[in-house]
Interface confidence: low
């Protein structure tokens, strides 16, 4: 004989000894009908705010307040947004590994430093976890007796540098 609790809709609860479908009380929900109890709705407070309010059939969904991001399944905790020099992983904010950087606040991933030598340029300023390498001008390969004319700004009377 089919128990009438089996016919209960989501948003209700039902006890086997009194098989009547009853609506979930306020601040509770039941996504599956026929359960003996409704579940207490999640409250989004503190560093959480409501993404979706609770209904009789669905739990509330939380998200993190400005400047924080979710961690864990169903946003079980809030962690401060990553700062430059870090990237967000499943384990939270992690410092960029050597040779990589992230110059963005709260978002982005660690990217490899620019390889200046691929463009035939020298490293003018070394990179950090927050900043990319600064490449210098292209490296000029001098042949003997090359003359470079250096003209200071604001005047034509230049200097000659003889490279032997």
């Amino acid at each position: 004989v089919q128990n009438s609790c089996d016919n209960c809709q989501p948003g209700t609860f039902c006890r086997k000894y009194n098989p009547v479908c009853k609506s979930c009380p306020p601040s509770t929900f039941s996504s599956i009908g026929g359960q003996p109890n409704c579940n207490i709705c999640r409250v989004c407070a503190g560093y959480f705010r409501f993404k979706k309010f609770c209904s009789s059939t669905h739990n509330a969904e939380c998200e993190c307040i400005e400047g924080f991001h979710c961690l864990g399944p169903q946003c079980t905790r809030c962690e401060k947004d990553c700062r430059p020099g870090q990237e967000l992983t499943k384990q939270g904010c992690k410092t960029c590994s050597l040779g990589t950087f992230n110059d963005q606040n709260g978002t982005g991933v660690c990217r490899p430093w620019t390889n200046c030598s691929l463009d035939g340029r020298s490293v003018l300023k070394t990179g950090t976890t927050e900043k990319d390498v600064v490449c210098g001008p292209p490296v000029v390969s001098f042949s003997p007796s090359t003359t470079i004319s250096v003209t200071p700004e604001g005047g034509p009377g230049g200097h000659s540098l003889q490279v032997l």
Epitope: V43, A45, G46, Y47, T76, C78, K80
Partner: antibody, heavy 117, light 107 residues
């Protein structure tokens, strides 16, 4: 209302052990990292340890590493600080605290631990 | 460890005055700074987190500012209930560290 109530303090001899407890109520305990902070007159406030919301990760200050063990029972909304090989410099008031944005947004009333022979 | 140097150590002032307490970090803490108030025989209470965000229920006469290594707590129009010791705390990196405190008294 968020409440944190510590217990288990008292007088203990150097080298012996003591276990502190902290009962939490008024918030969803398993959503929050928790911490112990101590305060001694000459040293001021010192962070002791932090435990992640699910108990999977713990962090300790160097001076207690290997001697103190921080654990939690989310079903009971309770924290524990097992303190072994106690030293005179561990004498302090110990507070359990809820971790907010790295800060400690709620504190218990504190429990005194005196390590002396 | 990041050292937090708080100044002044103590401060004697009058009701209605404006109070400034400074906190200097030994390295950049990227605004990960909190301020606490502690009254005698009581546990500390969070006033401000993330440099300038007021904790719920904290009067608006309290404000925080700063960046990099330098931070400050300002109390406008001092009230008698503000007499306490104030601590700064960095939570940028473990181990989290506190300043030694500033004891605020009335003249």
């Amino acid at each position: 209302e968020v409440q944190l109530v510590e217990s288990g303090g008292g007088l203990v001899q150097p080298g012996r052990s003591m276990k502190l407890s902290c009962a939490a109520s008024g918030f969803t305990f398993n959503n929050y990292d928790m911490a112990w902070v101590c305060q001694a007159p000459k040293r001021g406030l010192e962070w002791v340890a932090t435990i992640s919301y699910d108990g999977s990760t713990t962090y300790y200050r160097d001076s207690v590493k290997g001697r103190f063990t921080f654990s939690r029972d989310n079903a009971k909304s309770t924290l524990y600080l097992q303190m072994d090989s106690l030293r005179s410099e561990d004498t302090a008031t110990y507070y359990c605290a809820r971790v907010g944005a790295g800060d400690f947004d709620y504190w218990g009333q504190g429990v005194m631990v005196t390590v002396s022979s | 460890d990041i050292r937090m140097t708080q100044s002044p150590v103590s401060l004697s002032t009058s009701l209605g005055e404006t109070v400034n307490i400074e906190c200097l970090a030994s390295e950049d803490i990227y605004s990960d700074l909190a301020w606490y108030q502690q009254k005698p025989g009581k546990s500390p209470q969070l006033l401000i987190y993330s440099t300038n965000t007021l904790q719920n229920g904290v009067p608006s006469r309290f404000s925080g500012s700063g960046s990099g290594t330098q931070y400050s707590l300002k109390i406008n129009s001092l009230q008698s209930e503000d007499v306490a010791t104030y601590f700064c705390q960095q939570n940028n990196n473990y181990p989290y560290t506190f300043g030694a405190g500033t004891k605020l008294e009335l003249k």
